[in-house]
Interface confidence: medium
Amino acid sequence: SAPGEDEECGRVRDFVAKLANNTHQHVFDDLAGSVSLSWVGDSTGVILVLTTFHVPLVIMTFGQSKLYRSEDYGKNFKDITDLINNTFIRTEFGMAIGPENSGKVVLTAEVSGGSRGGRIFRSSDFAKNFVQTDLPFHPLTQMMYSPQNSDYLLALSTENGLWVSKNFGGKWEEIHKAVCLAKWGSDNTIFFTTYANGSCKADLGALELWRTSDLGKSFKTIGVKIYSFGLGGRFLFASVMADKDTTRRIHVSTDQGDTWSMAQLPSVGQEQFYSILAANDDMVFMHVDEPGDTGFGTIFTSDDRGIVYSKSLDRHLYTTTGGETDFTNVTSLRGVYITSVLSEDNSIQTMITFDQGGRWTHLRKPENSECDATAKNKNECSLHIHASYSISQKLNVPMAPLSEPNAVGIVIAHGSVGDAISVMVPDVYISDDGGYSWTKMLEGPHYYTILDSGGIIVAIEHSSRPINVIKFSTDEGQCWQTYTFTRDPIYFTGLASEPGARSMNISIWGFTESFLTSQWVSYTIDFKDILERNCEEKDYTIWLAHSTDPEDYEDGCILGYKEQFLRLRKSSVCQNGRDYVVTKQPSICLCSLEDFLCDFGYYRPENDSKCVEQPELKGHDLEFCLYGREEHLTTNGYRKIPGDKCQGGVNPVREVKDLKKKCTSNFLSPEKQNSKSN
């Protein structure tokens, strides 16, 4: 874990002069109102900044926009508003940036009332040029790119039409009417729900789920009595109304909706909801809301088919009203997730899992922190993390937890140390081992970002007063240096760095404010001269992830395998560089019973790793059905945890039981499916 700050803080020499030479100010002369920023492509250095200003007139609001472009990571900007004919761009649609490095951008313009359709501006050369296109409809949503082909766009119209373009927005065709929700699936497939009797709201629970695999030439109805649907990993989920009452259930398909299985999850009533918290090609985390306005529910984790679910975490905080949950995927270490639970006493506590939801535990108390007033025992308490819920409650939390896949093991978050989350002003904590151990990194709330794959962490104090100081660390948050980036303080509005944490540039956005003038300003700081040399082999050290007991042969085994990483030494001040690739060495572990989950009809008694047959199937277990057809369930009671790669060791093969429990999903019996062509 990261040791606390000590006397031997490695200071970066002459950093003020080095950073001053690499600090670029840009004042946006005619700028106010709101500003939005988008990166176009990866490693291109192209940033688009769209500013909008609403002019209040007596009867209506008239808006104006400016569009700026940088191609050097924000050091310089050029006003390119003339490329969009000085048109007002609708910020609620944002800037639709194409997938991967397609260089495509779509801006949706405001058009005067009474026009036949909307207007878009399209670029396919990283915003060097734009083409104006008048639409045959008024868009309701932002243009959605097909993940497989950035020339294919879809959009919903204000009249609930589903429109598709095959030539990057040049020509549009309405492929279906009465559409509520549409999403791209894999292989340029479109899934969408339709209503029959008037509106999406009126028909909720009676919608039909459709699929087109050829951009609207032909269609297939793949679901009826639909409430909503969602895609996660390779799974297609639909919540379907029950025949007999107002409850609904989750059905899952892994073949794009051709066949469905009822998920072994509780049904929910009108006031409840399901939510896919996270999904990959192996499994899914599903939240099922409790009855009543409790603000919590239960997390279930699926098997590899998305059908059998294990209860993962009770009393999981997920507010019904605002739809806030603290569920966070820690992307810097495999299998790690953090979330909050609502205790019996209504306090909120943070829980962490290191094995993809198998077991949850409290976060270890940071060595360099004392327990706060929420702690009954001043020597025993935990770290509690502030995330979306705290932000929604307007606590002094400027940022959600941060982790990056290429900054292995690093997690940064606001938190408090006690028995539960505190409403007091939080501090910033860091973990360098994926959440096993934590250290207080900065006093008070801050904005923070990771640069150069973890080689630099940058932070700015969250303050209502103007600021002119940035903090940075080259040793994963142990030691901090401060740099005054401007003489005249600015009202800070945000930190911007290129997604992916590979960049060495950070942009500080804000505005200068005097009684008569308000101007946006950005300062872009390039840290390349701080990290003077490229990292070499000697700068890296071997680190075993998930290591808790080095004496144990199985130490580091999570989901059947362990991984050793090459990690940058904290004392090394060097550039990982833009082309840095995480180096890891996996090794397979022997299987134990913990590598298996209990299959349908089986459960694990308290403190036992064996799966035992349920004496009788009750409630939703009884209704559970496989593949949407009547069939006998045969199982040996165990199923390998999704993504688990263990080999050898314990092999829980035993007599295959025929549970002889008939269960039916008449949601989609084959006779209910039909096809049609345009």
């Epitope: 005619d30 700028l31 106010a32 109102g33 500013t51 200003f53 002019v55 209040p56 104006q64 400016k66 209502s464 009202y491 404010e513 009684f515 008569l516 003038t517 308000s518 101007q519």
Partner: antibody, heavy 124, light 106 residues
Framework: QVQLVQSGAEVKKPGSSVKVSCKAS????????ISWVRQAPGQGLEWMGG????????NYAQKFQGRVTITADESTSTAYMELSSLRSEDTAVYYC?????????????????WGQGTTVTVSS | DIQMTQSPSTLSASVGDRVTITCRAS??????LAWYQQKPGKAPKLLIY???SLESGVPSRFSGSGSGTEFTLTISSLQPDDFATYYC????????FGGGTKVEIK
């Protein structure tokens, strides 16, 4: 249509303080500045200072520095001007006005909406 | 602070006359100048902002010009309703008003 409604006339003794309020209705309060301008009998207009309600950012004319305090309450869309250590020369009509600012492409720079004025008389 | 000098302080004119009022700033204020009209017992009314932009609802006989340090308010054809006091106001840094020009009936 935005309106600024000021508090009623005041009669004050020399050395005391006066606090005049200015309530905005019918439009956005926060995006503009509010200026305070006074006019002594038979004299011209004199700017005292102003505030940006969005951040409570106040600015004062040199002449009134230390003697005037301008505040704003966003929740009630009300601005206040307090003048202390009153003397007979402070007898005047005090106006609040919505002040356009150099923000954005709409350089709305004048004081386009005015309150009805509050007469403050300082007399022993 | 920037000083604003308005001239003349009083101006006698008749209905239909073309009237010009000038305002001089002690240093350059770019175009950050506004003109107001005030009648006795009433609050001032904005006529021109940003030196030459006409406030909505103001008759087109009013116009403003100038930049830097020299500014002019022109009433192309004086109407009975135009007899009032006119003030210029700069807005570059702290705000200051000119001393006023009273337009009275000749």
């Amino acid at each position: 249509q935005v309106q600024l409604v000021q508090s009623g006339a005041e009669v004050k003794k020399p050395g005391s303080s006066v606090k005049v309020s200015c309530k905005a209705s019918g439009g956005t309060f926060r995006n503009y500045a509010i200026s305070w301008v006074r006019q002594a009998p038979g004299q011209g207009l004199e700017w005292m200072g102003g505030i940006i309600p969005i951040g409570g950012w106040a600015n004062y004319a040199q002449k009134f520095q230390g003697r005037v305090t301008i505040t704003a309450d966003e929740s009630t869309s009300t601005a206040y001007m307090e003048l202390s250590s009153l003397r007979s020369e402070d007898t005047a009509v005090y106006y609040c006005a919505r002040q356009g600012r150099k923000t954005g492409y709409y350089y709305y720079y004048g004081m386009d909406v005015w309150g009805q004025g509050t007469t403050v008389t300082v007399s022993s | 602070d920037i000083q604003m000098t308005q001239s003349p302080s009083t101006l006698s004119a008749s209905v239909g006359d073309r009237v010009t009022i000038t305002c001089r700033a002690s240093q350059s204020i770019s175009s950050w100048l506004a003109w107001y009209q005030q009648k006795p017992g009433k609050a001032p009314k904005l006529l021109i902002y940003k030196a030459s932009s006409l406030e909505s609802g103001v008759p087109s006989r009013f116009s403003g010009s100038g930049s830097g340090t020299e500014f002019t308010l022109t009433i192309s054809s004086l109407q009975p309703d135009d007899f009032a006091t006119y003030y210029c106001q700069q807005a570059d840094g702290h705000i200051t008003f000119g001393g006023g020009t009273k337009v009275e009936i000749k």
